[in-house]
């Protein structure tokens, strides 16, 4: 059974997933962005299910296309490049959803943007949180 | 309005070390970069280190391995706890404040505090 330590440190890094995908957000959706009309042809695989931890793993194998489309954004000056970003998203998602169990993804049959695929995770985290506290 | 108060600078002997703390006061919002940046005489302001309040972290190449970010979102204060410096490092450091990832006109900026490694 999970300890309140435990449960403490999840929601924590829970926490943190969720700033760093609302940051990410944030940068796409900035009105000065002038890469967003590119950035939004570029599809995502959505989770067909996702409520529970293990369902990470569906974001997790996303992460890497999420960097690249987040690369064309090419700012001379990052205070944070996106590898830093997606580097420490990889390290909570793996911490989160455990290496114990082998969970095989299922996508829903509809891509979507990168606004909605954030959205959709951002949610996921919201949900968890809220369960939680 | 965002208003940064650093503190932490002085003179060290090669080797030494120093902690720099910036808190950060007024509109702050809950997702955002906080860091530094260092200006030494005639050169460019340059990254030295910069953190998300979701833990991502950016180091220069010069501090990796010797200089360590950190931050307590709570208290939206950031510290860089500088290790084994060096005579190169002697600059101005700059505490920053952004809320986003990549620099625009918004980003907001301390009055800087003086870091002198000299033997």
């Known amino acids: 059974a999970p300890t309140s330590s435990s449960t403490k440190k999840t929601q924590l890094q829970l926490e943190h997933l969720l700033l760093d995908l609302q940051m990410i957000l944030n940068g796409i959706n900035n009105y000065k962005n002038p890469k967003l009309t590119r950035m939004l042809t570029f599809k995502f695989y959505m989770p067909k299910k996702a409520t529970e931890l293990k369902h990470l793993q569906c974001l997790e194998e996303e992460l890497k296309p999420l960097e690249e489309v987040l690369n064309l954004a090419q700012s001379k000056n990052f205070h944070l490049r996106p590898r830093d970003l997606i580097s420490n998203i990889n390290v909570i998602v793996l911490e989160l959803k455990g290496s114990e169990t082998t969970f095989m993804c299922e996508y829903a049959d509809e891509t979507a943007t990168i606004v909605e695929f954030l959205n959709r995770w951002i949610t996921f985290c919201q949900s968890i949180i809220s369960t939680l506290t | 309005e965002v208003q940064l108060v650093e503190s932490g600078g002085g003179l060290v002997q090669p080797g030494g070390s120093l902690r720099l703390s910036c808190a950060a006061s007024?509109?702050?919002?809950?997702?955002?970069?906080m860091g530094w940046y260092r200006q030494a005489p005639g050169k460019q302001r340059e990254l030295v280190a910069a953190?998300?309040?979701?833990?991502?972290?950016n180091y220069a190449d010069s501090v990796k391995g010797r200089f360590t970010i950190s931050r307590d979102n709570a208290k939206n204060t950031v510290y860089l706890q500088m290790n084994s410096l060096k005579p190169e490092d002697t600059a101005v450091y700059y505490c920053?404040?952004?809320?986003?990832?990549?620099?625009?006109?918004?980003?907001?900026w301390g009055q800087g505090t003086q870091v002198t490694v000299s033997g």
């Open positions: 920053m404040y952004a809320s986003s990832w990549y620099e625009d006109e918004t980003d907001y």
């Open positions: 007024g509109s702050i919002f809950s997702i955002n970069v």
């Open positions: 953190i998300s309040s979701g833990g991502s972290t």
